[in-house]
């Protein structure tokens, strides 16, 4: 039977090395073995090139297509091939469609005044141009209690986030992630990063403990709680 | 070191044909796009033609499109320029050079960084 | 087509002066920051080109830092400054961003 294109290829690409595009078959496809999407740049001299694409699900395929850093005027022309049949042309503007990368290392450390101090990694190298262009969301969860979340907005430039110990559940273990968007490139959300975990403790002052007091437990507790959720 | 070595020029009368060929050592031939500028004699350069490394994309001038054709065998590093239909105005000194880096995905440019030395196409009756 | 237009057509310079060739452009020959897709390119007599200028500004291998460009978008300047006799010639400038590439009509520099 005929090859038929269900839903047309999605592109996003993350401005520095790579574009990924994902489209859906009419019915389940071998995409390796079936489909090639070919991709060239629109500018003089630029050679054709072909990217194999992989399952995503039954149906559905992928293909990674390694790009020059990204500048607005990239414009690629794109065509989906099974065998000599074109299934599908169309046309990609890296900087229209931007999905930033995903940032990094995410750690969660005791800070002073009762604070955890959440920090994670730009994805970007500092002469790129989404370095300096990057806002974050940060999603704090109770591990226990799926109606205990919180979510911030950091939109000033460091990748740090101040969290104050009181407003979270004390002896409750937490997990937080982060996404990032590029809001000058209007780009989509980022993929969460991992998660990681730590236990929450917090004495109210009641309790008359001193600040030190305080302190050495959140450290304690964290060190003994990070060594055994190391990579969650 | 690098090195361009045209041939093939000749005195040809209007109508006729012609093959130029371009010989290039000392650089990944296969890697680089090339060009043909030619120039008549006391005027100015005029950009001819453009092919890309693999050969796979090519580009002309209007003054000579349909009439010539650019082409290379990266096998035996040479650039060739086929000409036909030759008129008196297409007398001139004709140069291949070394263009842009076409093996990346947006190609590295250089300006045209080396040229050769130049064969002489006479048209005449 | 884009077309290129270099002024003045010829310029004579005394030696270890400054001379200055402008080159307009019909289009833009900025595609992103820094990369402006202008050359310029020098010619002796009886000789073939040579490449001085690429992406407006930056030297080719092997020229002397006496000579410099300059410019963005559509307007671009070839400075040469300490003028040497050696330095006479015919200067062109071209635009490498869209087919057909052009050249300017050239400069005759003269040295005094």
């Known amino acids: 039977g005929s090859v038929k294109v269900l839903h047309e290829p999605s592109c996003f690409s993350d401005y520095i090395s790579t574009s990924v595009c994902q489209w859906k078959m009419d019915h389940p496809t071998n995409c390796s073995a079936e489909l090639r999407l070919s991709y060239q740049l629109d500018f003089m001299g630029s050679e054709n090139h072909t990217c194999v694409p992989e399952n995503r699900e039954d149906s559905v395929c992928v293909c990674s297509m390694p790009i020059d850093d990204a500048v607005e005027a990239d414009v690629y022309q794109l065509d989906l091939w099974a065998g000599q049949q074109l299934l599908w042309s169309g046309s990609f503007q890296p900087s229209k469609h931007v999905k930033p990368r995903t940032p990094g290392n995410l750690t969660v450390h005791p800070n002073i005044s009762h604070t955890w101090l959440l920090m994670w990694t730009n994805p970007y190298p500092t002469e790129n141009h989404l370095h300096s262009e990057l806002t974050y969301m940060v999603n704090v969860s109770n591990d226990n209690d799926p109606e205990d979340f919180k979510v911030y907005n950091v939109t000033y430039m460091g990748p740090t986030l101040r969290l104050a110990a009181s407003t979270l559940k004390s002896g409750a273990s937490y997990s937080a992630r982060v996404r990032a968007w590029a809001q000058t490139y209007n780009s989509t959300w980022s993929d969460w990063s991992p998660s990681t975990t730590w236990l929450n403790y917090y004495e109210p002052w009641e309790q008359h403990l001193g600040l030190n007091d305080i302190f050495e437990a959140q450290k304690i507790e964290w060190h003994e709680h990070h060594h055994h959720h190391h990579h969650h | 070191e690098v090195q361009l070595v045209e041939s093939g020029g000749d005195l040809v009368k209007p109508g006729g044909s012609l093959r130029l060929s371009c010989v290039a050592s000392?650089?990944?031939?296969?890697?680089?796009?090339m060009t043909w500028v030619r120039q008549a004699p006391g005027k100015g350069l005029q950009w001819l033609s453009l092919?890309?490394?693999?050969?796979?994309?090519?580009y002309y001038a209007d003054a000579v499109k349909g009439r010539f054709t650019i082409s290379r065998d990266n096998a035996k590093n040479t650039l060739y320029l086929q000409m036909n239909s030759l008129r008196a105005e297409d007398t001139a000194v004709y140069y291949c050079?070394?263009?842009?880096?076409?093996?990346?995905?947006?190609?590295?440019?250089?300006?045209?960084?080396?040229w050769g030395q130049g064969t002489l196409v006479t048209v005449s009756s | 087509d884009i077309v290129m237009t270099q002024t003045p057509l010829s310029l004579s310079v005394s030696p270890g002066e400054t001379a200055s060739i402008s080159c307009r452009s019909s289009?833009?020959?900025?595609?992103?920051?820094?990369?402006?897709?202008l050359d310029w390119y020098m010619q002796k007599p009886g000789q073939s080109p040579q490449g001085l200028i690429y992406?407006?500004?930056k030297r080719a291998s092997g020229v002397s830092d006496r000579f410099s460009g300059s410019g963005s978008g559509a307007d671009f300047t070839l400075k040469i400054s300490r003028v040497e006799a050696d330095d006479a010639g015919v200067y062109y400038c071209?635009?490498?961003?869209?087919?057909?590439?052009?050249f300017g009509q050239g400069t005759k520099l003269e040295i005094k």
């Open positions: 050079a070394v263009d842009r880096l076409t093996k990346t995905i947006r190609p590295q440019y250089y300006g045209l960084w080396h």
């Open positions: 289009q833009s020959l900025t595609y992103s920051i820094g990369y402006n897709y």
């Open positions: 992406l407006g500004s």
């Open positions: 000392g650089f990944p031939f296969r890697d680089y796009a």
């Open positions: 092919i890309s490394g693999s050969g796979g994309k090519t």
């Open positions: 071209m635009q490498g961003l869209h087919s057909p590439l052009s």
